[in-house]
């Protein structure tokens, strides 16, 4: 069979080969298609078929509007003036070419080192449905590859029978990477050979988390234990720039003291004894809590121990 | 909504002619393939003729070949009927529907408009 | 020219039975084929298109199968509302043809 692709709504002429260019003539058409169930043999003399293909006077058969229900094979059957018999198979595909594909939702910022969404590429109107690919920077995203993945959905209208295809990319931008990358979505069509159609392209910013070191706790004196009446110093050590700021919790509770990296429990009393924290909050990155410290009272001729008690008689201050 | 409005009924002599007119409304009429069809008193139905959306193609049953004419005018939504050589046997109420190809057969019909042949 | 033989040409019955019409082309006509609703002095009404498509507006109880070239309507559970007559139409082949019709009539 000869395959003819037609696009969907366009008119499509197929040749009856070896009919005699004007009647009388001895030909059948007959079609197995969306539209029958097995060989539909067309009446010459037209009838409510005509609609969706007719017999032209020269023996061709027309299609005013192909449909996707016109998919399938068309056979003609010919009888010269001598009585020579010719026949013609035809095999037709149909499609449609959607609209330029866009994307929909876009980032403008990405974070690297965790998954972002970067957006969602909507094709409307193909058929077959083809297909739709990410590209970074102008070369192809692999999915399930180095921090990308792709959610895809197709739906089909119910009544038009074309097709929506969406793809949401997902990506985890490497740390030190382009800080600019350009992403760009392509449907390619199912049929025919055709070239792909391309979005506009998006250059979402990526932000590098400025990385957290360790929010450090020191003691004075060390172990933390001292004998009541003494001093304890908690000095809370954030390197990050800008400094952020500290607040102080004892026993899981924030102190109700103004925000100081540096924590005071002077003349210290069994009321001072439990466990410390501080917490640095940084305006990009939330809070940060440091190791706990177990403050505890040692009486004379006991052993510091490693984690020590202070006793003291009020509050802390802060210096 | 869609609308068909069927006129130009009456009392006509055996030989005579009538011209029968039907208004269209509600939908894109020369999209839609369209057609008569009639029912003689207390009988069934029968299909009169069609044509297609153009206007360039016209069917009939042989009862009517060559006595009826299908027409339409797309730029005024109007279908029509010439019935030329009329008989008693055509008396009957004459509906006008929309469709008659295998996309659509017919969905919708207006109210009729009846047609007595009779001296 | 296809025959579509439909029977029976009437019927009596009680609102809520079940009731089926049958029509037999006489060739092969594929899906093409409607039914209609008639009521005295009005227009045919189109229940089923493309011998088993519901159409728009049409109540469920109404139904329409197709084996072969034998197409069914039937009424799930008649009302009040459906005594009338219903007719079959073939729409693949000139000359259209309709069935004879059947007429629904309360016992």
């Known amino acids: 069979a000869q395959n003819i692709t037609a696009r969907i709504g366009e008119p499509l002429v197929l040749k009856c080969k070896g009919a005699p260019k004007k009647p009388p003539q001895q030909l059948e058409w007959k079609l197995n298609t969306g539209r029958t169930e097995a060989w539909k043999v067309l009446s010459p003399q037209g009838g409510p078929w005509d609609s969706v293909a007719r017999v032209l006077p020269n023996g061709s058969l027309f299609l005013p509007a192909v449909g996707i229900q016109d998919e399938g094979i068309f056979r003609c059957q010919a009888m010269n003036r001598n009585g020579k018999e010719t026949k013609s198979n035809y095999r037709v595909r149909v499609y449609q070419i959607p609209g330029k594909p866009e994307i929909i939702d876009s980032a403008s910022e990405l974070t690297a080192g965790v998954p972002n969404k970067v957006g969602t590429c909507v094709s409307e109107g193909s058929y077959p449905a083809g297909t739709l690919s990410w590209h970074l920077d102008g070369k192809p995203l692999v999915p399930n590859e180095k921090g990308v993945s792709v959610k895809e959905e197709t739906r089909r209208h119910p009544e038009t029978g074309l097709f929506t295809l969406q793809s949401e990319l997902m990506v985890t931008p490497a740390r030190g990477g382009n800080p600019h990358p350009t992403f760009s979505c392509s449907f390619s069509p199912g049929l025919p050979r055709r070239r792909a159609l391309h979005t506009a392209p998006i250059q979402p910013r990526v932000w590098e988390p400025v990385p957290l070191e360790e929010v450090q706790l020191v003691v004075e004196p060390e172990g933390g234990a001292v004998a009541p009446g003494g001093t304890v110093t908690l000095t809370c050590e954030v390197p990050a720039q800008p400094s952020p700021q500290i607040h102080w919790m004892k026993d899981g509770v924030p102190l109700p003291l103004s925000p100081s990296p540096v924590l005071i429990l002077p003349e210290i009393g069994p009321q001072d004894q439990g466990t410390y924290r501080c917490v640095a909050t940084h305006p990009s990155h939330g809070p940060q809590e440091s190791r706990a410290v177990s403050i505890s009272i040692i009486e004379p001729g006991e052993e510091g121990p490693t984690a020590g008690s202070v006793g003291g008689s009020g509050p802390g201050t802060l210096a | 909504e869609v609308q068909l409005v069927e006129s130009g009924g009456g009392l006509v002599q055996p030989g005579g002619s009538l011209r029968l007119s039907c208004a269209a409304s509600?939908?894109?009429?020369?999209?839609?393939?369209m057609t008569w069809v009639r029912q003689a008193p207390g009988k069934g139905l029968e299909w009169v003729a069609s044509?297609?959306?153009?206007?360039?193609?016209?069917y009939y049953p042989d009862s009517v070949k060559d006595r009826f004419t299908i027409s339409r005018d797309n730029a005024k939504n109007s279908l029509y009927l010439q019935m030329n050589s009329l008989r008693a046997e055509d008396t009957a109420v004459y509906y006008c529907?929309?469709?008659?190809?295998?996309?659509?057969?017919?969905?919708?019909w207006g109210q009729g408009t009846l047609v007595t042949v009779s001296s | 020219d296809i025959q579509m033989t439909q029977s029976p040409s009437s019927l009596s019955a009680s609102v809520g039975d079940r009731v089926t019409i049958t029509c037999r082309a006489s060739?092969?006509?594929?899906?093409?084929v409607n039914w209609f609703q008639q009521k005295p002095g009005k227009a045919p009404r189109r229940l089923i298109y493309?011998?088993?498509n519901l159409a728009d507006g049409v109540p469920s109880r109404f139904s329409g199968s197709r084996s072969g070239t034998d197409f069914t309507l039937t009424i799930s559970s008649l009302q009040p509302e459906d005594f009338a007559t219903y007719y079959c139409?073939?729409?693949?082949?000139?000359?259209?043809?309709f069935g004879g019709g059947t007429k629904v009539e309360i016992k």
């Open positions: 529907a929309r469709g008659g190809d295998i996309t659509t057969g017919f969905d919708y």
């Open positions: 509600g939908f894109t009429f020369n999209n839609y393939w």
């Open positions: 044509i297609d959306n153009s206007g360039d193609n016209t």
């Open positions: 060739q092969d006509v594929g899906i093409y």
């Open positions: 493309r011998a088993t």
């Open positions: 139409l073939e729409f693949d082949e000139h000359p259209l043809t």
